[in-house]
């Protein structure tokens, strides 16, 4: 199931790249699958927020991107996530790339990586 999530993530990143006009030489942070959840591409200076993933949810390939971006570009997400909410993790897009997740997944979500046995 997590392989499927990863594949869905890569598809969503590709669609987001097209929408945002991103390519390999674009400044900013590429979308990524971090083995827990999916992070969409972002411009330098943007903070991206994601909800804690539901471990065993089946992803719908046509779902809207389940993140919220704060910064100069708005991806048009319907969610209104906020770091004052429970179960929200953020990363900043910096000139050096993505920051570490804040808070750490383990503290915000109760787990920090998928177990290999599941």
């Amino acid at each position: 199931i997590f392989k499927k999530e990863q594949a869905m993530c890569l598809e969503k990143i590709q669609r987001a790249n097209e929408l945002m006009g991103f390519n390999d030489s674009s400044p900013g942070c590429p979308g990524m699958w971090d083995n827990i959840t999916c992070w969409k591409p972002a411009h330098v200076g943007e903070m991206v927020l994601v909800s804690c993933p539901e471990l065993f949810r089946i992803f719908n390939p046509d779902q809207v991107w389940e993140t919220e971006t704060i910064g100069e570009s708005d991806f048009g997400d319907s969610n209104s996530l906020d770091l004052s909410d429970m179960g929200v993790v953020s990363r900043n897009c910096t000139e050096d790339g993505w920051s570490e997740p804040f808070p750490h997944y383990f503290d915000a979500c109760g787990f920090d990586e998928y177990e290999s046995e599941t």
Partner: antibody, heavy 123, light 107 residues
Framework: QVQLQQSGPGLVKPSQTLSLTCAIS??????????WNWIRQSPSRGLEWLGR?????????HYAVSVKSRITINPDTSKSQFSLQLNSVTPEDTAVYYC?????????????WGQGTLVTVSS | DIQMTQSPSSLSASVGDRITITCRAS??????LNWYQQKPGKAPKLLIY???NLQSGIPSRFSGSGSGTDFTLTINSLQPEDFATYFC?????????FGPGTKVDIK
Amino acid sequence: QVQLQQSGPGLVKPSQTLSLTCAISGDSVSNRLATWNWIRQSPSRGLEWLGRTYYRGKWKNHYAVSVKSRITINPDTSKSQFSLQLNSVTPEDTAVYYCARGVWIGNWFLDHWGQGTLVTVSS
Amino acid sequence: DIQMTQSPSSLSASVGDRITITCRASQMIARYLNWYQQKPGKAPKLLIYASYNLQSGIPSRFSGSGSGTDFTLTINSLQPEDFATYFCQQAIINPYTFGPGTKVDIK
């Protein structure tokens, strides 16, 4: 009924290693839904979380920065217990040390505690 | 580190009183906050987790509220066994810091 029973010396000399053990009954140190923590309490520092170990297919540890260079928390699956080692102790490490189980429901909290062990660091 | 402050540091009350203890975090912690009760010579005991959830076996006269940086623990109709010290703890950023405690004694 989860119970945590602590053991270890109450007196440690400066520069030596403080070693305590926490025996778990009614649960397992390998429980994938729990964490196993050490906390200490002193008049000068109050309650201070020191670190935790947990199993999620592999063993992991998180430590407080204030003791990270000196602390080791190890699980012992054969005895369902876990231990604390704190190296190079000074009189400032004098405190009551507690072990506790961490559980997640919306956030991590400590729902069962050991009885506490007063450790005095003195020559 | 996130600093946790509590007020008051101590209070005197009578059986049957309603008391409120406040806890403030030095930065936003959403609702990642726990409350513990400690009696002399004993380990802390969990009362409330995630700001307002009552731990199993804890009487309903205890309640918690708050989000962000400001939190409260309320004890309705104080009972003799409630005279103790109460600590808050933030549970989102390592190290998971505790407040300095509020001692509740008999007036």
